[in-house]
Interface confidence: medium
């Protein structure tokens, strides 16, 4: 049993890491492995993840961690039985991805404007919260063509958008996520997508 | 029993290149991790490089950072390093050693060749 | 990179005595290190993996001891054999570093 792509880890900077990795062949992630992963720091315990299978190969196993601060670093060391297979360090602030952002509610009765909004995913005291930009994803359910996305690089969780940009009488849906520069971080995962009924008075034309 | 046979050592000039080749067996070979080590005449062991079982994950020491290369055929059994942009200071007996571990540096060296002379001077 | 900063470089001692050769590591290297011996026109030997693991068919008169981040081999009474290299090996994260080399001498 071997390790053919090393584990690679991402953490929400708050709570959960996750790492990734595939085997040199099918394998049963929670019963023949085990990854070891420990602070660098005095006096901190190790702790055990049990890994689940990602796919025939591939496990995946999420480490839950304190809150994390950028100077922290864990040791990994992944088991199988009494065997090491790998061992390596991840350092959770050099590998941030943040958690999707919720609650996405698209507000229509604001006269001809729409207005999305939605839930930033970090408590006000993480330090993620005040630094998060978005993106936000609109596309018609009925014409793949109409696809588009709109740079939310305001903190504020909400973009407004005049509903004549948007195709009258067919339905929308919107999805967001989140990055933050300062940690250089990759994109989150997308929200769940919210669907509404796009529908405004056009403007009378004069002949 | 472990058996590493080193070869393709010798007297090359400055700024030329070599291949060195590490035959082994006795053991299953792509179950495990294997690197280079030399020694200078009368000085210490240095690590040069290492190898993951399947060659994929890579290590050199800086002092042969971007002029040379690990590389291994499984299918041969065999351990490779290309070494180009020779200098002086690259004179040595050059050994080839098995690892403990299969995905780089678990246990260091636990199998040692009897190793290669490379002499680099003009 | 990690260093490793081994001491004494060289030691003269009898057969019967006890030696202790020290290596510390520049930053924490958990106990990811080994203990070779190397005679003159000789391959590396493997006496110690995992900092206090014997390798198989290494006299148990060879022990390793670590404490934070200084290491030690100790023979517990040197044999005539026993003459010969010591070199610690980093073996934590790459660039693998080995220390400089303790040179155990006949008295």
């Known amino acids: 049993m071997k390790v053919l792509q090393e584990p690679t880890c991402v953490s929400d900077y708050m709570s959960i890491s996750t790492c990734e990795w595939k085997m040199n062949g099918p394998t049963n992630c929670s019963t023949e492995l085990r990854l070891l992963y420990q602070l660098v720091f005095l006096l901190s315990e190790a702790h055990t993840c049990i890994p689940e299978n990602n796919g025939g190969a591939g496990c995946v196993c999420h480490l839950l961690m304190d809150d994390v601060v950028s100077a922290d670093n864990y040791t990994l060391d992944l088991w199988a039985g009494q065997q090491l297979l790998w061992k390596g360090s991840f350092k959770p602030s050099e590998h941030v991805k943040p958690r999707a952002p919720g609650n996405l509610t698209v507000h229509t009765n604001v006269s001809d404007t729409l207005l999305l909004t939605w839930s930033n995913p970090y408590p006000p005291d993480n330090y993620l919260y005040n630094h998060l930009t978005y993106a936000v994803n609109i596309w018609s359910e009925n014409d793949p063509a109409d696809f588009r996305i709109y740079n939310v690089t305001y903190l504020e969780p909400s973009l407004r958008i005049a509903a004549s940009t948007l195709k009258s009488g067919i339905s929308y849906r919107a999805r967001v996520r989140a990055w933050a520069q300062c940690y250089n971080t990759t994109w989150s995962e997308w929200s769940p997508s919210t669907k509404w009924h796009n529908s405004y008075r056009e403007p009378f034309e004069q002949h | 029993e472990v058996q590493l046979v080193e070869s393709g050592g010798g007297l090359v000039q400055p700024g030329r290149s070599l291949r060195l080749s590490c035959a082994a067996s006795g053991f299953t070979f792509d179950d495990y991790a294997m690197h280079w080590v030399r020694q200078a005449p009368g000085k210490g062991l240095e690590w040069v490089s290492g190898v993951n079982w399947n060659g994929v994950s890579l290590g050199y020491a800086d002092s042969v950072k971007g002029r040379f290369t690990i590389s291994r055929d499984n299918a041969k059994n065999s351990l490779y390093l290309q070494m180009n942009s020779l200098r002086a200071e690259d004179t040595a007996f050059y050994y080839c050693?098995?690892?403990?571990?299969?995905?780089?540096?678990?246990?260091?060296?636990?199998?040692w060749g009897q190793g290669t002379t490379v002499t680099v001077s003009s | 990179d990690i260093q490793m900063t081994q001491s004494p470089s060289s030691l003269s001692a009898s057969v019967g005595d006890r030696v202790t050769i020290t290596c510390r590591a520049s930053q924490g290297i958990r106990n990811d290190l080994g203990w070779y011996q190397q005679k003159p026109g000789k391959d590396p030997k493997r006496l110690i993996f995992a900092a206090t693991n014997l390798h198989g068919g290494v006299p148990s008169r060879f022990s390793g001891g670590v404490s934070g981040t200084e290491f030690t081999l100790t023979i517990s009474s040197l044999q005539p054999e026993d003459f010969a290299t010591y070199y610690c090996?980093?073996?934590?994260?790459?660039?693998?570093?080995f220390g400089g080399g303790t040179k155990v001498e006949i008295k």
């Open positions: 090996l980093q073996h934590n994260s790459y660039p693998l570093t």
């Open positions: 050693a098995k690892d403990s571990g299969s995905y780089h540096y678990y246990y260091g060296m636990d199998g």
